[in-house]
């Protein structure tokens, strides 16, 4: 993790996670990159590519659509979320080009790194409210009849948005360049002030808040939707909820290396060999957490196109099918079983 | 023209303290750049102990981390240099030296240091 | 640590000669050498920094070469002043650290 102390008696280890490559020894010993910096380079340029043209053409398509459109709301919310990190990376590559040397000043240092960050819990808040939404669809389709609308859909967007921004100021506050002279170069990360505590606090929050407890929260809430839709349903197409486990599962799994190795640098010492090698994994774990930026997208195309590999529309239309279906409850006022199962079976949110 | 100046003791006893004062004239040790003190044994090896930077972080060889300490009067221009449990071994010249980056710019006269009962 | 190696301890020259000193590094030191001259007085003064460059004041008969782990600096005309001890260091990675010099004297 990019942390480091201004009064450290040693080198300590240059990297929070939120940056890539501070508190440890500054190793451009030779003009050649690590392997797992190659590899983040490799990484970063596929996202950005596919992540802003994706998340380009998802907002594109939801923005005409989110009006009257639910799903298309919690789509657009979550693209530009991807989107807005997939901005930081050009940056983020240049900087590990250049051993991480940060020449783009302290405000980019404060706000481009942490936009992961906003982007982790963006999506995660992002992706409990659908789930919550998803879940009222099948347990409450009564009250998503009266209450169920667009207003009260941007509220929670707002407030997901709003607790995000929040979540991510310890980042934003702590992060700082320094100037190191051998090499010369400029760092940028996070500085703790030599309190070892508080930088525990900061990843244990980011652990608990940003993966494990909405892991177990969405758990239990997908397994109680999976029991109900199957348990009500005879001609099973579990089409959405591919498309929602799928979208959900990529968030854990590509969030898990950064979080396991930020909890596990936080409570190790910046000179101990696992710390050194979990430093040297840094900018691989913060640009496997970046795939996220650029995988739902993928997943919409692969939904799209009903999971056989061939595309039989052009992008826009196949993925203003997939984002933009609304569910049942918004139509029908008369309210059957069926409906609630047909409702739950063809709602595409995530 | 920035100059730098060192003084110290010039004779210590084993096992004891010694400090080492560099005094910066002609520019401030808070504007910029990192302030030095490095060391020349009598077989003329030169070995670098560490720094203070314009911004007050400090960096220091890790053969002598656990004896060293490097601070700083910015009201005076001054940075400081404290060795504990001296030996023999630390017998030298100690220079203080400005770095812009990556190499030593300009250095002080010295100050001879001998350790000795 | 990066060790800096001068294999020559001491060489005697005449004035007016060409003088080269080597020095090596034991792993690739990227551009970050640097050259020192410190006189009988044990004045030490900066020469040459990121292998060639010359740093202000520093008479143009002086010059620096290399790449990777090896690296020498030249002195096209030896002049009495430069008589003196040199020493090579790598600025890549912490802790810098400097070459055992080499001495220039007179023949």
């Known amino acids: 993790m990019d942390s480091f102390n201004y009064t450290t008696p040693d080198y300590g280890h240059y990297d929070d996670k939120d940056t890539l490559d501070l508190n440890t020894p500054v190793d451009k010993t030779s003009n050649t990159l690590r392997v797992p910096d190659i590899l983040a380079l490799v990484i970063f340029a596929v996202v950005f590519l596919v992540g802003v043209l994706g998340n380009a053409l998802v907002v594109w398509v939801t923005a005409f659509e989110a009006k009257r459109t639910i799903n298309a709301i919690w789509f657009l919310n979550l693209a530009v979320a991807d989107f807005l990190s997939c901005l930081a990376l050009p940056i983020l590559f240049t900087s590990i080009v250049q051993h991480h040397h940060w020449p783009f000043g302290g405000a980019a240092c404060s706000i481009l790194p942490s936009l992961i960050l906003l982007n982790m819990y963006a999506s995660i808040l992002l992706l409990a409210t659908i789930s919550a939404d998803r879940f009222l669809l099948v347990f409450k389709p009564i009250w998503c009849q009266n209450f169920r609308g667009a207003g009260l859909a941007w509220i929670a967007c707002a407030v997901a948005w709003g607790l995000a921004l929040l979540l991510t100021i310890p980042s934003f506050l702590y992060r700082v360049v320094r100037e190191e002279y051998f090499p010369p170069k400029v760092l940028c990360g996070v500085d703790y002030s030599h309190d070892k505590r508080r930088e525990r606090a900061v990843a244990i929050v980011r652990l608990v808040l940003g993966f494990l407890w909405p892991l177990l929260t969405l758990t239990i809430c997908y397994t109680f939707i999976l029991l109900r839709t199957w348990s009500r349903r005879a001609t099973r197409s579990t089409k959405t909820l591919k498309v929602v486990v799928a979208v959900v599962a990529s968030f854990f799994i590509f969030w898990l290396p950064y979080q396991v190795t930020g909890i596990m640098m936080s409570f190790l010492e910046p000179s101990s060999p696992t710390f050194l090698l979990l430093k040297k994994l840094d900018s691989l774990c913060v640009s496997f957490a970046y795939i996220n930026c650029c995988i739902n997208p993928i997943i919409y195309v692969v939904a799209g196109q009903g999971f056989q590999g061939r595309l039989r529309k052009s992008l826009p239309s196949l993925l203003r099918n997939v984002l933009t279906e609304e569910s049942v409850v918004r139509e029908s006022k008369s309210f059957t079983r069926s409906t609630v199962d047909t409702m739950a079976q063809k709602t595409q949110a995530v | 023209d920035v100059q730098l100046q060192e003084s110290g003791p010039g004779l210590v006893k084993p096992s004891q303290s010694l400090s080492l004062t560099c005094t910066v004239t002609?520019?401030?040790?808070?504007?910029?750049?990192?302030w030095n003190w490095i060391r020349q044994f009598p077989g003329n090896k030169l070995e670098w102990m560490g720094y203070?930077?314009?911004?007050?972080?400090?960096r220091y060889n890790p053969s002598l981390k656990s004896r060293i300490s490097i601070t700083r009067d910015t009201s005076k221009n001054q940075f400081f240099l404290q060795l504990n449990s001296v030996t023999t071994e630390d017998t030298a010249t100690y220079y203080c030296?400005?770095?812009?980056?990556?190499?030593?710019?300009?250095w002080g006269q010295g100050t001879t240091l001998t350790v000795s009962s | 640590d990066i060790q800096m190696t001068q294999s020559t301890s001491s060489l005697s020259a005449s004035l007016g000669d060409r003088v080269t000193i080597s020095c090596r590094a034991s792993?690739?030191?990227?551009?970050?050498l640097n050259w020192y001259q410190q006189t009988p007085d044990g004045t030490v003064k900066l020469l040459i920094y990121?292998?060639?460059r010359l740093h202000s004041g520093v008479p143009s008969r002086f010059s620096g070469s290399g790449s990777g782990t090896d690296y020498s600096l030249t002195i096209s005309n030896l002049e009495e002043e430069d008589i003196a001890n040199y020493f090579c260091?790598?600025?890549?990675?912490?802790?810098?650290?400097f070459g055992g010099g080499t001495k220039v004297e007179i023949k």
């Open positions: 030296a400005i770095t812009t980056g990556g190499y030593f710019d300009y």
């Open positions: 002609g520019y401030s040790i808070t504007s910029d750049y990192a």
């Open positions: 203070i930077s314009y911004s007050g972080s400090i």
């Open positions: 792993q690739d030191i990227s551009n970050y």
């Open positions: 990121q292998i060639s």
């Open positions: 260091q790598q600025g890549n990675s912490l802790p810098p650290t």
